[in-house]
């Protein structure tokens, strides 16, 4: 999947664009908003009716090297009595993000953009029920 | 930057950390994943904390279209199909990396940008405090 070129409907390519070899693009990995602190709701993963745990995956050939994945704790959802109700389903909610992958071929190094699917949390859903003949 | 194990036979000049600027292949590796969450599942409608999906489009960004979730209700849907306001629909937020055209409008020059997106909603049981 290629990154779309800038459409002329939006704007003309400025003269100031850096020269880039064919088939590749220049990527600055100094992240914009790197230090912005987000005030996430505290411990929603524990208070949710479809609670989840977090696992940190680590890969030194990936940037960022740390990616956090959520896993639903239960198959069902937690009811008002604090018990698991298996007539409902805890399901993962997923979001794509981009990472930079470093590849070693002998002593040369190349870089590749990669889409990674991250599970960010869980939600409680009413299952669609089919009765099989 | 992050440290990388190096092949012992390679020249010592290679940097252990990711360089600040890299040249990357224009093809993005991985799964022609469906970026429209409306097509990938109907959880947004079947959840006890349902949400609407809003299209956020920016031609200076890749991906140019990002879907933002907004919880439909303050409370959660109970077994009778009514909103229970003793529970909360809460957005699940996630920081993701996108590409920002830099300098602006350039077709093949980008910078990574971290943005916060609401991906969906979850139903939460709040701890209740009575204020004196």
């Amino acid at each position: 999947r290629k990154i779309p070129k800038v459409g002329h409907t939006f704007f003309q390519k400025p003269e100031s664009c850096p020269p880039v070899p064919g088939g590749s693009m220049k990527l600055d990995i100094g992240i914009i908003n790197e230090n912005q602190r987000v005030s996430m709701s505290r411990n929603i993963e524990s208070r949710s009716t479809s609670p989840w745990n977090y696992t940190v995956t680590w890969d030194p050939n990936r940037y960022p090297s740390e990616v956090v994945q959520a896993q639903c704790r239960n198959l069902g959802c937690i009811n008002a009595q604090g018990k698991e109700d298996i007539s409902m389903n805890s399901v993962p909610i997923q979001q794509e993000t981009l990472v930079v992958r470093r590849k070693h071929q002998g002593c040369s190094v190349s870089f590749q953009l990669e889409k990674v699917l991250v599970t960010v949390g869980c939600t409680c859903v009413t299952p669609v029920i089919h009765h099989v003949q | 930057g992050i440290t990388i194990p190096r092949n012992p036979g390679c020249p010592n000049s290679e940097d252990k950390n990711f360089p600040r600027t890299v040249m990357v292949n224009l093809n993005i590796h991985n799964r022609n994943t469906n970026t429209n969450p409306k097509r990938s599942s109907d959880y947004y409608n079947r959840s006890t904390s349902p949400w609407n999906l809003h299209r956020n489009e920016d031609p200076e960004r890749y991906p140019s279209v990002i879907w933002e979730a907004k919880c439909r209700h303050l409370g959660c849907i109970n077994a009778d199909g009514n909103v229970d306001y003793h529970m909360n629909s809460v957005p699940i937020q996630q920081e993701i990396l996108v590409l920002r055209r830099e300098p602006p409008h350039c077709p093949n020059s980008f910078r990574l940008e971290k943005i916060l997106v609401s991906v969906g909603c979850t139903c939460v049981t709040p701890i209740v405090h009575h204020v004196a």
Epitope: S39, S41 | C71, L74, N88, I127, V128
Partner: nanobody, 116 residues
Amino acid sequence: EVQLVESGGGSVQPGDSLRLSCAASGRANSINWFGWFRQAPGKEREFVAGIRWSDAYTEYANSVKGRFTISRDNSKNTVDLQMDSLRPEDTAVYYCVLDLSTVRYWGQGTLVTVSS
């Protein structure tokens, strides 16, 4: 610690208006929504109206839709409930509620009496 100060309750006649206010102070950051519940004598506490902090989305109980209006002032952490065309069945103790997603704070309540 969070403090909630409610004001504006009182006695009115049917058809009259009243405006309730609630001010939050202390560690009232990361607000999810702000709103009002009420409890009539011998009845369960019920939701009246709420306003989401992030985008000012509002929600109302069917019984008050079209008569009550909730509004907020972000800079002051206050929420107001404008109650018009009041009815005897609106008589109740009105509780201000500040919701921080995983924690919810209830005020002490202010009495609204509607009778002729």
